[in-house]
């Protein structure tokens, strides 16, 4: 059978739980400096479905700061600058990977976790349910 | 600064690069048990700034498939269903973490990487630059 060539530069794992517990290099490749979404664009203010950004901070998680969007209105902003309730502001959500310290407070031991975050809001036509 | 209390049950790290290289349990914990992000919506079709989802695939990355939003129009859909070019459809971007094997083919060594993805689109009022 084909075996994966063992790279001599691979760290050796003595862990009995292998392959579930592995070494992860946190020296992030492609480190984008702008992590605060307010700095990257002002869409959250200019959108017809504007949102506020809330700082979600957790020292037991990496990244420790995640920005969560909350739509400002149920409706959307119309051309007159008023809220139109015939349309809906809704959050766009995405599942992301984070690392959580496990056991808690361990500086160098984590678990991979998937969490759902709201990234921004968009304006949608509502689904109308007709009464039979 | 705040120091994390040392938990006696923590795995010990002899790594000189600590805290850049950490132990991670890869048995993914999913916190989204009640809200499945895939099921969440057909907002991409119902939005006034609709978008298409394009597959970004990389077999050496986890997740291997990431969906990228591309706004369908430069403008936004108005109440008549037409594109209004006085408004702009713009992508909402987010930085996410992915895992990459490093060195390649090492079964127990990974590197965290940040990538920027477009999650969806929102409709914004354009910035008008007045000519002096």
């Amino acid at each position: 059978g084909i075996t994966i060539p063992r790279n001599p530069g691979c760290p050796n794992s003595e862990d009995k739980n292998f392959p579930r517990t592995v070494m992860v290099n946190l020296n992030i490749h492609n480190r984008n400096t702008n992590t605060n979404p307010k700095r990257s664009s002002d869409y959250y203010n200019r959108s017809t479905s504007p949102w506020n950004l809330h700082r979600n901070e957790d020292p037991e998680r990496y990244p420790s700061v995640i920005w969560e969007a909350q739509c400002r209105h149920l409706g959307c902003i119309n051309a007159d600058g008023n809220v139109d309730y015939h349309m809906n502001s809704v959050p766009i959500q995405q599942e992301i990977l984070v690392l959580r310290r496990e056991p808690p407070h361990c500086p160098n031991s984590f678990r991979l976790e998937k969490i759902l975050v709201s990234v921004g809001c968009t304006c949608v036509t509502p689904i109308v349910h007709h009464v039979q | 600064g705040i120091t994390i209390p040392r938990n006696p049950g923590c795995p010990n790290s002899e790594d000189k690069n600590f805290p850049r290289t950490v132990m991670v349990n890869l048995n993914i914990h999913n916190r989204n048990t009640n809200t499945n992000p895939k099921r969440s919506s057909d907002y991409y079709n119902r939005s006034t700034s609709p978008w298409n989802l394009h597959r970004n695939e990389d077999p050496e990355r986890y997740p291997s498939v990431i969906w990228e939003a591309q706004c369908r129009h430069l403008g936004c859909i108005n109440a008549d269903g037409n594109v209004d070019y006085h408004m702009n459809s713009v992508p909402i971007q987010q930085e996410i973490l992915v895992l990459r094997r490093e060195p390649p083919h090492c079964p127990n060594s990974f590197r965290l990487e940040k990538i920027l993805v477009s999650v969806g689109c929102t409709c914004v009022t354009p910035i008008v630059h007045h000519v002096q």
Partner: antibody, heavy 117, light 106 residues
């Protein structure tokens, strides 16, 4: 080109277990999951569960919880599906498939498991 | 579990015909719907993913549409090699398949 090659047909007695293998050739498992899907004679397709070989993370369909075990050996690029407490209604073709967590894009050729006393 | 209901369960058509198969989900699944083709004694083959995206190598006569709960697979001009069973599958939640649609020669 990814190819998934499965082990041969099996005949088993009710109450016993079967272990089917699925070997990825022409490449490693990469970061995809491997899912197992079965098809009883003349019937439709039924998802049983999956594993992400990179991580060892498994996910099982509720119907098979406790009776199916999916494992993977990265050194040989092989995934395994073991089904225990076999009954006649488990007679089916068992497929492994590469799973992006959105669709199944490469399938094994299938393994017929016959449960008969 | 999300139930997937295909219709019709079988259809007879001639080479060159336009064929439409529908699939309905028991709840909204956004666009997380795939279509597969299966020939006798063979494994299924992915045709369409994410409701409307054509898998590479699949002829352009196959197309998919729909969103939410109602989806359609269309074969614009049926070819002799298209006679097979077609399955829809959702991946909004743990995967489930439709019961299949058999496309037979008229």
């Amino acid at each position: 080109q990814v190819q998934l090659v499965q082990s041969g047909a099996e005949v088993k007695k009710p109450g016993s277990s079967v272990k089917v293998s699925c070997k990825a050739s022409g490449g490693t498992f990469s970061s995809y999951a491997i899912s197992w899907v079965r098809q009883a004679p003349g019937q439709g397709l039924e998802w049983m569960g999956s594993i992400i070989p990179w991580f060892g993370t498994t996910n099982y369909a509720q119907k098979f919880q406790g009776r199916v075990t999916i494992t993977a050996d990265e050194s040989t690029s092989t995934a395994y599906m073991e089904l225990s407490s076999l009954r006649s209604e488990d007679t089916a073709v068992y497929y492994c498939a590469r799973d992006s967590e959105y669709y199944f894009d490469h399938w094994g050729q299938g393994t017929l498991v016959t449960v008969s006393s | 579990d999300i139930q997937m209901t295909q219709s019709p369960s079988s259809l007879s058509a001639s080479v060159g015909d336009r064929v439409t198969i529908t699939c309905r989900a028991s709840q909204g699944i956004s666009n997380w719907l795939n279509w597969y083709q299966q020939k006798p004694g063979k494994a299924p083959k992915l045709l369409i993913y994410a409701a409307s995206s054509l898998q590479s190598g699949v002829p352009s006569r196959f197309s998919g549409s729909g969103s939410g709960t109602d989806f359609t697979l269309t074969i614009s001009s049926l070819q002799p090699e298209d006679f097979a069973v077609y399955y829809c599958q959702q991946y909004s939640d743990d995967p489930t398949f439709g019961q299949g649609t058999k496309v037979e020669i008229k």
